[in-house]
Each structure stands twice: as C-alpha cells, then as structure tokens.
C-alpha cells in the first residue's frame, strides 16, 4: 500500500481543515488509514483522524482544530496499521479557503435599489473576521447572458444596487462567497442562491 | 462575549500561600489555552506559565519551578494558579490570559500583596 | 529568561506619528511572530498587534506593526491623549524550553 498523491490540506481558519489524497488502488481508507496531526506547541496533544473515501483510491479527513491561529504548524503522519506511509506538516494561515458566508437574503423595498445583505461567516473574534471581502454574484433565470459579478471590496456584508439595472418583471438569483487578501486565501463555496422577482417603475418618458 | 473573571486581592504573609482563579465564560473553556503573567510595581510583563484546560498539561517558567502549581476545573471553567512559599518579591498583580502564541483576552488582574 | 529591549520612554504631540522600537535577536524576534500590548494605568494589557503586522477586530489602524530580523517596530499616527500608556512588545523565545517573553515597556506621553 503506498501513496500515490500526498495529502494536501486546506484550513477554515476556524475549526476544521480538509486534508486529501490519493492512494495507490482502491482503499477503504477508514478502515485501512489513519491520518495522525498534532500542533507543534507546548501541551499539545496527538489527535487522530479517520478518513472517509473520496472516489476508489481517494481519501478525505476532517481534522478538527481549536483557535486556529497564524503561528500554528501541524505535524502529519498518515498510518497504515503499524505501517508510516507519509510524513509531513500543514501550516492552516497558509492554506486558507474561508466558509461560505451565509443567509443572504435580497431587500426589495427600498425604493427601485436592491439591498443584498448576507452575514459574515466567523465570529468577531476570530482573526479572519475582520479581513474578508466578497464577490456577489447575480443572473437571470431565464437568460444566460445576463450574469454579473460584483465586488464587495469593503468589510460591510451588503451590497447596493439600482434596481433598474437589471430588466423588469423576471427573476433573478444572488450568491456570494468570500476571500481574505491578507491571508491570501482561496475564494470559498458559493453561498446557496437567493431567488426574487425583479420589478420597478420604468421612469415615465414624454 | 469572551470574558476572564479573576478573584479578589490578597494580602499574605511571607512563607505562605496564595491561590489565584480565573472564571472563563463565552467560550468553549477547553479550547483554548490560559497562560499567567504577573507584573511587580511599576515593572513589566513576567510570564510564569500555561496550562492547556483540556487534558489539565503544564508547563512552568523555569524560574517558578517548583513553587507555581497550575490547575483547571472544567465543571466550572476555572482555572487556578497557586503560588507557594511567597516572599516580598512576589507582591505584584497577577493576570491570567487566553491564546496561544499571544494573548487576546486578559482577566483584569488580582493584586497580591505580600508583607510581614 | 532573556527580556526584549524596548526605549524607556517616548513622546509626540497629539496627531503626530510615533515609533516604538523592540530589540530581539535569532532565538526570539528572529524566529518568532511579534505582538504589542497596551496597558492604559491601572488596567489590564490589550492586545494591539499580532502575527508581526496584524490588527485585531476593533483596533484603528492608526496602530501598525513591523518586523525585521531580529528587531520589531510599533508605529502610532494621529496620535491621541487616550494613547498615552505603556506598549509592551511579546514573542516566543525558542531556546529550550520555549516560552513567552516581553519588553521592557515603554511609556508613551502625548504632550
């Protein structure tokens, strides 16, 4: 049994990083593997992961980590029984992909403005919290063309527009995710989508 | 919201004991390590040790070996830092603090004063 | 356990800019992340700066931190007469056992 890809890992910032691999034929990866990761700190304790398949030969594992924090390196050891198939480290600040913020919701009784306003996925204290910025993303349901990205490069999780510049009287879609430059992170998921009916009064020409 | 609630000042005699604690509320108590510091009159920052609230590990200033004892109570989110055969040098205000590599959240200190 | 060199005092007139320097070597500064610390009197230290240069949630960013080798830097502009208190700067000293140490502190008077 050997390791055809090693783990790579990226980190919430926050509690959960998601290591992946590949082995080098099919594997039951939790029966078979253990993926072993300790914080090269005072007091730390050795914790154990067990991976769950990802595809025939590939392996997934959730290691869960608590105040996570730029200075902190892990040490990896992934185990086959008595066996050390690979050994490594995992810096989480420099492999970041935030969460997905969450529970956008569009506001359509402001007058012909659309306010989209969702929440920041991380708690104030968290360090990430106060470094993300954003991307919303908004198209039509019924024309694919009509597909915008607008970037929310201010920490405020809102976004103002002008209703009349989408069309009238169809439906639109909202999603947005989130990256912190100073972290150099990945975007996140997409949030789940938002549906509204767009409408306003065309101004009245003469 | 995260907060650090350290006990009463103290008054002791030369020889004897003291045991400081420091209430944690607003946070998984177990998640975090607490560390102590203390900071004599009119001088700076000395730290004297951590304690990791999950498995109730130590690990002390070498210069308090053997005369700090660091303990936590999960029941309560509590953690203690007892300070043995006290001298005038040890008369200072004595703080507890949560992180790791550095410190975010600071208990508001407990005074010691320690006189014959 | 070896202590970081910081200048005793330092002042500047309200708005000014003002630095205050910490001094490590390869075995602290030079191998660690640096913090700063603020202590109004008779209050606790807060944390100002982490991870070198990083500001914490709530903290204007008329406080700024650098690093380099084996010495740090806290720079304040627009200086305030809220600002006047001592800074403290932190790291981890790696020589075994690793530990936490401190500045010396300096004070800050805004005149």
């Known amino acids: 049994m050997k390791v055809l890809q090693e783990p790579t890992c990226v980190s919430d910032y926050m509690s959960i990083s998601t290591c992946e691999w590949k082995m080098n034929g099919p594997t039951n990866c939790s029966t078979e593997l253990r993926l072993l990761y300790q914080l090269v700190f005072l007091l730390s304790e050795a914790h154990t992961c067990i991976p769950e398949n990802n595809g025939g030969a590939g392996c997934v594992c959730h290691l869960l980590m608590d105040d996570v924090v730029s200075a902190d390196n892990y040490t990896l050891d992934l185990w086959a029984g008595q066996q050390l198939l690979w050994k490594g480290s995992f810096k989480p600040s420099e492999h970041v992909k935030p969460r997905a913020p969450g529970n956008l919701t569009v506001h359509t009784n402001v007058s012909d403005t659309l306010l989209l306003t969702w929440s920041n996925p991380y708690p104030p204290d968290n360090y990430l919290y106060n470094h993300l910025t954003y991307a919303v993303n908004i198209w039509s349901e019924n024309d694919p063309a009509d597909f915008r990205i607008y970037n929310v490069t201010y920490l405020e999780p809102s976004l103002r527009i002008a209703a009349s510049t989408l069309k009238s009287g169809i439906s639109y879609r909202a999603r947005v995710r989130a990256w912190a430059q100073c972290y150099n992170t990945t975007w996140s998921e997409w949030s789940p989508s938002t549906k509204w009916h767009n409408s306003y009064r065309e101004p009245f020409e003469q | 919201q995260v907060q650090l609630v350290q006990s009463g000042a103290e008054v002791k005699k030369p020889g004897a004991s003291v045991k400081v604690s420091c209430k944690a509320s607003?946070?998984?108590?177990?998640?975090?390590?607490m560390h102590w510091a203390r900071q004599a009159p009119g001088q700076g920052l000395e730290w004297m040790g951590i304690?990791?609230?999950?498995?109730?590990?130590?690990s002390y200033a070498q210069k308090f070996q053997g005369r700090v004892t660091m303990t936590r109570d999960t029941s309560t989110s509590t953690v203690y830092m007892e300070l043995s055969s006290l001298r005038s040098e040890d008369t200072a205000v004595y703080y507890c603090?949560?992180?790791?590599?550095?410190?975010?959240?600071w208990g508001k200190g407990t005074l010691v004063t320690v006189s014959s | 356990q070896s202590v970081l060199t910081q200048p005793p005092s330092v002042s500047a007139a309200p708005g000014q800019k003002v630095t205050i320097s910490c001094s490590g070597g390869?075995?602290?500064?030079?191998?660690?992340?640096v913090s700063w610390y603020q202590q109004l009197p008779g209050t606790a230290p807060k944390l100002l700066i982490y991870d070198n240069n990083k500001r914490p949630s709530g903290i204007p960013d008329r406080f700024s931190g650098s690093k380099s080798g084996t010495s740090a830097t806290l720079a304040i502009t627009g200086l305030q007469t809220g600002d006047e208190a001592d800074y403290y700067c932190g790291t981890w000293d790696t020589s075994s056992p690793p530990q936490p140490i401190f500045g010396t502190g300096t004070k800050l008077t805004v005149l």
């Open positions: 390869s075995s602290n500064i030079g191998n660690s992340y």
């Open positions: 607003g946070y998984a108590f177990t998640s975090y390590y």
């Open positions: 603090a949560r992180g790791k590599w550095w410190w975010q959240y």
């Open positions: 304690i990791n609230p999950s498995g109730g590990s130590t």
